[in-house]
Interface confidence: low
Amino acid sequence: GELETSDVVTVVLGQDAKLPCFYRGDPDEQVGQVAWARVDPNEGIRELALLHSKYGLHVNPAYEDRVEQPPPPRDPLDGSVLLRNAVQADEGEYECRVSTFPAGSFQARMRLRVLVPPLPSLNPGPPLEEGQGLTLAASCTAEGSPAPSVTWDTEVKGTQSSRSFTHPRSAAVTSEFHLVPSRSMNGQPLTCVVSHPGLLQDRRITHTLQVAFLAEASVRGLEDQNLWQVGREGATLKCLSEGQPPPKYNWTRLDGPLPSGVRVKGDTLGFPPLTTEHSGVYVCHVSNELSSRDSQVTVEVLDPEDPGKQVDLVSAS
């Protein structure tokens, strides 16, 4: 006869490990007992359990409530045991020694491998600002046994670097993702992907990128000169910019206070019916936590009644 077993048994932390040991013999052969031992290079061989054809199962007190036979129906030639709720300390070599009649004794060894699936954590880097050089966007750490694989899944252009720290029973892997921040990256997902043989599927943690920036400011509203004549209503200047965080807008007049009746509403400066008093240099000041920008325009309100200021449409054409 011979023993049917496995060279390596692999389980995930907390699962039950089936240690296989089946005697394949002639029909008239019988298994008297199966002795299970833990084989430790330092502590030698320690009893785990004894399966006896008459006396039943005996379990070493150190493994009380943790070692069982597989549920019935059981083949009398099957000496397999279940090691409940495997922990990392269970990793190592195990031996089954089968005593048969009349063929004698057989033994086999196997290695139990306990996988510790990682629980990854993602840490964003320092605040990202447009104009910075290569900057840490995020780091992702995962510890497990064996060492997990940590990679990044993103459309964003960047570089990744990994480092490992080996502990007695596990390994921690940290991967960093560096990039050169630009406003186009705002809102883009950066996903840490952790792979491990103890995981049915990759674990993914997504970080949404936030890049602080402030665009140049410009002013719109002076395109149609006909709107800027004395008496016209509804004239406005609009300040154009964008940023993250969203910017605040402030309007001033370079050569004095804003004329009475002029209303500021966020990025827009609204004028009452125009008079020549509204002529002047207006400044839009845009700012957020990152920076500030200015844009200034000169408003000239024309008086059609003033011959000196009239436009000669004939010569202009």
Partner: antibody
Framework: EVQLVESGGGLVQPGGSLRLSCAAS????????MSWVRQAPGKGLEWVSA????????YYADSVKGRFTISRDNSKNTLYLQMNSLRAEDTAVYYC????????????????WGQGTLVTVSS | DIQMTQSPSSLSASVGDRVTITCRAS??????LAWYQQKPGKAPKLLIY???SLQSGVPSRFSGSGSGTDFTLTISSLQPEDFATYYC?????????FGQGTKVEIK
């Protein structure tokens, strides 16, 4: 079809004992962690206790530690909650629920719940 | 223990409304967050697990979002059968803890 059926609730005096059972069917019972969650009348949900698939690990809320004992019999597909030294504030509907082990002591959310059994502690 | 703070504690809405419930954890819990629906006299029913994954058999009008400490449950178009109490629960650490619940009532 997954089914969890609680039983054993009833009226008990303060200081008394009660044993709740939860009969499971439709899934491999020993592969799942099991929990007890309670709900006092008109109140929210409160986790009480949990036990790993093998029964080797047990967990308790501080409010019941030392008074309640969770156990399971995987051969009978049954979860138990032994409740001793009962107090008025233990009055609640008690639900059993199942969850899967991910790794370490981290479990999934409870995807199936029983219909609950009412425990009333009053003199 | 991790505290879970849900808001609002109750809300009134009409059929077809978009409803949003928020849940805040007292410390980071990654995405170890579940949302449950409970109707009077019934057991809780799992709607969302892992913060944003829809449990099998749950209508797609339910959605979840968030990670870390701040989470949201959204019902895109409230249906008559959605009037119930909703709970968030963290299972990042033991003991797992629930929010105090949000009762969604008919306006």
């Amino acid at each position: 079809e997954v089914q969890l059926v609680e039983s054993g609730g009833g009226l008990v005096q303060p200081g008394g004992s009660l044993r709740l059972s939860c009969a499971a069917s439709g899934f491999t019972f020993s592969s799942y962690a099991m929990s007890w969650v309670r709900q006092a009348p008109g109140k929210g949900l409160e986790w009480v206790s949990a036990i790993s698939g093998s029964g080797g690990s047990t967990y308790y809320a501080d409010s019941v530690k030392g008074r309640f004992t969770i156990s399971r019999d995987n051969s009978k597909n049954t979860l138990y909650l032994q409740m001793n030294s009962l107090r008025a504030e233990d009055t609640a509907v008690y639900y059993c629920a199942r969850a899967e082990l991910l790794a370490f002591d981290v479990y999934t959310a409870s995807d199936y719940w029983g219909q609950g059994t009412l425990v009333t502690v009053s003199s | 223990d991790i505290q879970m703070t849900q808001s609002p504690s109750s809300l009134s809405a009409s059929v077809g409304d978009r409803v949003t419930i928020t849940c805040r954890a007292s410390q980071g819990i990654s995405s170890y967050l579940a949302w449950y629906q409970q109707k009077p006299g019934k057991a809780p029913k799992l709607l969302i697990y892992a913060a944003s994954s829809l449990q099998s058999g749950v209508p797609s009008r339910f959605s979840g979002s968030g990670s870390g400490t701040d989470f949201t449950l959204t019902i895109s178009s409230l249906q008559p059968e959605d009037f119930a109490t909703y709970y968030c629960q963290q299972h990042y650490t033991t003991p797992p803890t629930f929010g105090q619940g949000t009762k969604v009532e008919i306006k």
